[in-house]
């Protein structure tokens, strides 16, 4: 149940995360399942455990097998299994299916290819990218952080893409490669300057002190899958996370909807236990994409109780 397949090539670095993740700082013990032998934590070993990570620096075919990790707690030990397979390097260019990570799809407007598993490694930019074993060259290809962007994607761009990077551990460098397939979707989409549907510009939202209030920022960005589009809230020009008021939170994850074929996003701002001081703040709904940024400002006002006249 709590098992994960991991694979790598001999003489490359491979780092595996325990499939039963605890929070940071929990003790994690690693064992080689076949022998129940504990994996050492000393970094001088070629294979060693480092908290939630198991590191093969570098990997050998003989390392293949099932590794057990136990996230330790006096009341709730949690066990996971990492099924590790290390393959010999192929002499030819073909990357066999068993070395492939999940396929990603792209379109003319959205052509990001993420380098699989890279977040586990201590690497520095730039990444090297290859398609069908050929180094990618030309202005259409841009290596950006941990992904590759292809401009003006065409059907011929479909194929197997390999990222190559260097993992650094205590001054020693190890090579890592990872390959995934990229397919191209034919999508007649377009992108426009963001259009904010809600809230209206300079809207006054009535709220009740002591009650909860929700503000929705909703914007559309064009048709089809959008590349780099986001909506967010700011308080007095500051990101919600930086503002430091735990009562005021953005709903995690942006909801994506397609209204009349348009690609739209919305973000809900939740204010718990509305206070007087919340009425003094400026609430900005921001929508941004490659075309630019649009901002609508909302202010809160106290909802007056209805007067009952006899």
């Amino acid at each position: 149940k709590f098992s994960k397949q991991s694979w790598g090539l001999e003489n490359e670095a491979l780092i595996v995360r325990c499939p039963r993740q605890g929070k940071p700082s929990y003790t994690v013990d690693w064992y080689y399942s076949q022998t129940n032998k504990s994996i050492p934590t000393q970094e001088r070993n070629r294979v060693f455990a480092s908290g939630q990570l198991l590191k093969f620096l570098p990997a050998a075919v003989a390392d293949s097998g099932i590794y057990t990790c136990i996230v330790r707690s006096p009341t709730f030990n949690r066990t996971g299994y990492a099924n590790v397979t290390i393959y010999k390097k192929q002499s030819d260019c073909n990357v066999p299916d068993y070395l492939m990570y999940s396929t990603v799809s792209g379109s003319e407007k959205n052509s990001k290819i993420y380098c699989p598993t890279i977040d586990l490694y201590n690497w520095t930019a730039p990444l090297e990218w290859f398609k069908n074993c050929q180094a990618l060259q030309g202005s259409r290809y841009r290596a950006h952080k941990s992904f590759l962007v292809i401009d003006n994607v065409m059907t011929e761009d479909a194929g197997d893409y390999t990222c190559k990077f260097i993992h650094n551990e205590n001054g020693a460098n190890y090579s890592v490669t990872a390959t995934r397939s990229f397919t191209v979707k034919d999508e007649q989409g377009f992108s426009l300057f963001p259009v904010i549907g809600a809230p209206a510009q300079n809207e006054i939202k009535e709220v009740e002190i002591g009650k909860n209030a929700n503000l929705t920022c909703s914007a559309c960005f064009g048709k089809g899958t959008q590349f780099l589009a986001a909506v967010l809230w700011q308080l007095n020009g500051t990101k919600i996370t930086d503002f430091g008021e735990p009562r005021i939170q953005q709903e995690e994850g942006q909801n994506q909807s397609f209204s009349n074929g348009l690609a739209c996003l919305d973000m809900v701002l939740r204010i718990a236990d509305v206070k007087e001081e919340d009425l003094l703040l400026q609430y900005d709904c921001l929508a941004l994409n490659l075309h630019g940024l649009r901002r609508h400002t909302v202010r809160l006002s106290r909802k007056n109780p209805i007067d009952h006249h006899s």
């Epitope: 709590f2 039963r20 605890g22 929070k23 700082s25 929990y26 003790t27 996230v71 330790r72 707690s73 006096p74 009341t75 709730f76 949690r78």
Partner: antibody, heavy 117, light 111 residues
Framework: QVQLQESGPGLVKPSQTLSLTCTVS?????????WDWIRQPPGKGLEWIGY???????YYNPSLKSRVTISRDTSKNQFSLKLSSVTAADTAVYYC??????????WGQGTLVTVSS | DIVLTQSPASLAVSPGQRATITCRAS??????????MHWYQQKPGQPPKLLIY???NLESGVPARFSGSGSGTDFTLTINPVEANDAANYYC?????????FGQGTKLEIK
């Protein structure tokens, strides 16, 4: 995001059995974690009643063990609390929560149960 | 059972000042390099919210004004600087063994 919601009668007569259900959304209770019941008498502190793990194993507070049963309905993604032979001392806000490791990371809003004739 | 005793029962602190709450366990809650003590905040009418786990680790999304320290039997929650919004009850909880128990709580008021 895990969300929990308690439900059940707000009033129970002395000597009867208190029954509450916690409905979980956003996560399967058989996937992982432990699923707790905690109570808080009005104006007082928190008391851990017990929990049922994703595996179905149960752990109870010994002070309540003889009266407590925690069970689950996996088809509805719910887990339940039964507390028998209640007295006025069992009047409390009852919370369900999720223990991911050692801490209760997600909580329901709580439901007040009053024991009174 | 491990009994957790919090002190003070209540305290009043001005905004910008430091608030310190202690929790003493009737026996050690530390083992294998970790201290299994955690801290929660509870505001009126709301469920508790996790602040600190394993004595000193800040839960994701919790402001860095909150910090925890201690090992063995003596633990401290510190809020520095205190803000008006921090008015709440604070509870320690251990997970060294069953049953899991909570401290009796400390009420923080803002002057």
């Amino acid at each position: 995001q895990v969300q929990l919601q308690e439900s059940g009668p707000g009033l129970v007569k002395p000597s009867q059995t208190l029954s509450l259900t916690c409905t979980v959304s956003g996560y399967s209770i058989t996937s992982d974690y432990a699923w707790d019941w905690i109570r808080q008498p009005p104006g007082k502190g928190l008391e851990w009643i017990g929990y049922i793990r994703y595996s179905g194993d149960t752990y109870y507070n010994p002070s309540l063990k003889s009266r407590v049963t925690i069970s689950r309905d996996t088809s509805k993604n719910q887990f339940s609390l039964k507390l028998s032979s209640v007295t006025a001392a069992d009047t409390a806000v009852y919370y369900c929560a999720t223990t991911m490791m050692d801490t209760m990371d997600y909580w329901g809003q709580g439901t007040l149960v009053t024991v009174s004739s | 059972d491990i009994v957790l005793t919090q002190s003070p029962a209540s305290l009043a602190v001005s905004p910008g000042q430091r608030a310190t709450i202690t929790c003493r366990a009737s026996k050690s809650v530390s083992t294998s390099g970790n201290s299994y003590m955690h801290w929660y905040q509870q505001k009126p009418g709301q469920p508790p919210k996790l602040l600190i786990y394993l004595a000193s680790n800040l839960e994701s999304g919790v402001p860095a004004r909150f910090s925890g320290s201690g090992s063995g039997t003596d633990f401290t929650l510190t809020i520095n600087p205190v803000e008006a919004n921090d008015a709440a009850n604070y509870y320690c909880q251990h997970s060294r063994e069953f049953p899991l128990t909570f401290g009796q709580g400390t009420k923080l008021e803002i002057k």
